[in-house]
């Protein structure tokens, strides 16, 4: 009998009510592979989520998530808050990064500005809670017998104004 | 009551075509899904290809590339276009169709209703 139930192809069940013979998945239900003794019923996209592709009696439904979320976990098994730029999702809601800290993302966490000093290398555009600092050349590089096209700008050491 | 029949089968030479229909009769019937099956001499009849409830079509490997399922809804008839026959092929088919009871779509239902024809022989000499 193991058989007749290896010949049931996907989008059936080997249907142990009728002698094992393939069966069509019942409505809102699929098999994606062959040889299966049920079918499962489909994913439903509702409240936060909604149909990226429709089931089928061959495949589960896919849910991405709606305008504001964003997917986590595999096949988008949920879905978060999304914040703005420079802020992160907490407990509590959306706060704003701290200083020091950046998120140029909707999702995620803060995380600290380059320390630009640690490659040798000098601030050349400050860091915001949606930005990171931009490295420049090297203290040394800008020493005044140094060559360079343009002047070059002031060395300034990581940070911004606090808002 | 539910009623099918089907009709078109015969004797024909190995290569040959043959398409085969199934007439579903009765007041009220609404089927989510339709299918052919066929039980050759001595053997447990088999799964040959079905339309499934959201229109897929679906055939078993021995027959994929040479049998075409179809329907006119108008007629209430499904179809089977068998091509390139062979002797393999010669057994009794069957049109079953599929009905679920009650419409709860939210839960898998196994409660299923199936209505089957008489069949019609279709003998594939070499």
């Known amino acids: 009998l193991q058989d007749l139930c290896s010949n049931c192809p996907a989008g059936t069940f080997c249907d142990n009510n009728r002698s094992q013979i393939c069966s069509p998945c019942p409505p809102n239900s699929f098999s994606s592979a062959g040889g299966q003794r049920t079918c499962d019923i489909c994913r439903q996209c509702k409240g936060v989520f909604k149909t990226r592709k429709e089931c089928s009696s061959t495949s589960n439904a896919e849910c991405d998530c709606i305008s504001g979320y964003h997917c986590l976990g595999a096949e988008c098994s949920m879905c978060e808050q999304d914040c703005k730029q420079g802020q992160e999702l907490t407990k509590k809601g959306c706060k704003d990064c701290c200083f020091g800290t950046f998120n140029d993302q909707k999702r995620g966490i803060c995380r600290p500005w380059t320390n630009c000093s640690l490659d040798g290398k000098s601030v050349l555009v400050n860091g915001t809670k949606e930005r990171d600092v931009v490295c420049g050349p090297s203290p040394a590089d800008l020493s005044p017998g140094a060559s360079s096209a343009t002047p070059p700008a002031p060395a300034r050491e990581p940070g911004h104004s606090p808002q | 009551e539910v009623q099918l029949v089907e009709s078109g089968g015969g004797l024909v030479q190995a290569g040959a075509s043959l398409t085969l229909s199934c007439v579903i009769s009765?007041?009220?019937?609404?089927?989510?899904?339709m299918g052919w099956y066929r039980q050759a001499p001595g053997k447990e009849r088999a799964f040959v290809g079905t339309?499934?409830?959201?229109?897929?079509?679906i055939y078993s490997d021995s027959v994929k590339g040479r049998f075409t399922i179809s329907t006119d809804d108008g007629k209430n008839t499904m179809y089977l276009q068998m091509n390139n026959l062979k002797p393999e092929d010669t057994a009794v088919y069957y049109c079953?169709?599929?009905?679920?009871?009650?419409?709860?779509?939210?839960?898998?239902?196994?409660?299923?209703?199936?209505?089957w024809g008489k069949g019609t022989l279709v003998t594939v000499s070499s």
């Open positions: 079953a169709a599929y009905s679920v009871p009650y419409g709860d779509f939210c839960t898998l239902n196994y409660d299923l209703m199936d209505y």
């Open positions: 009765g007041r009220t019937f609404s089927s989510y899904a």
């Open positions: 339309i499934t409830w959201n229109n897929d079509i």
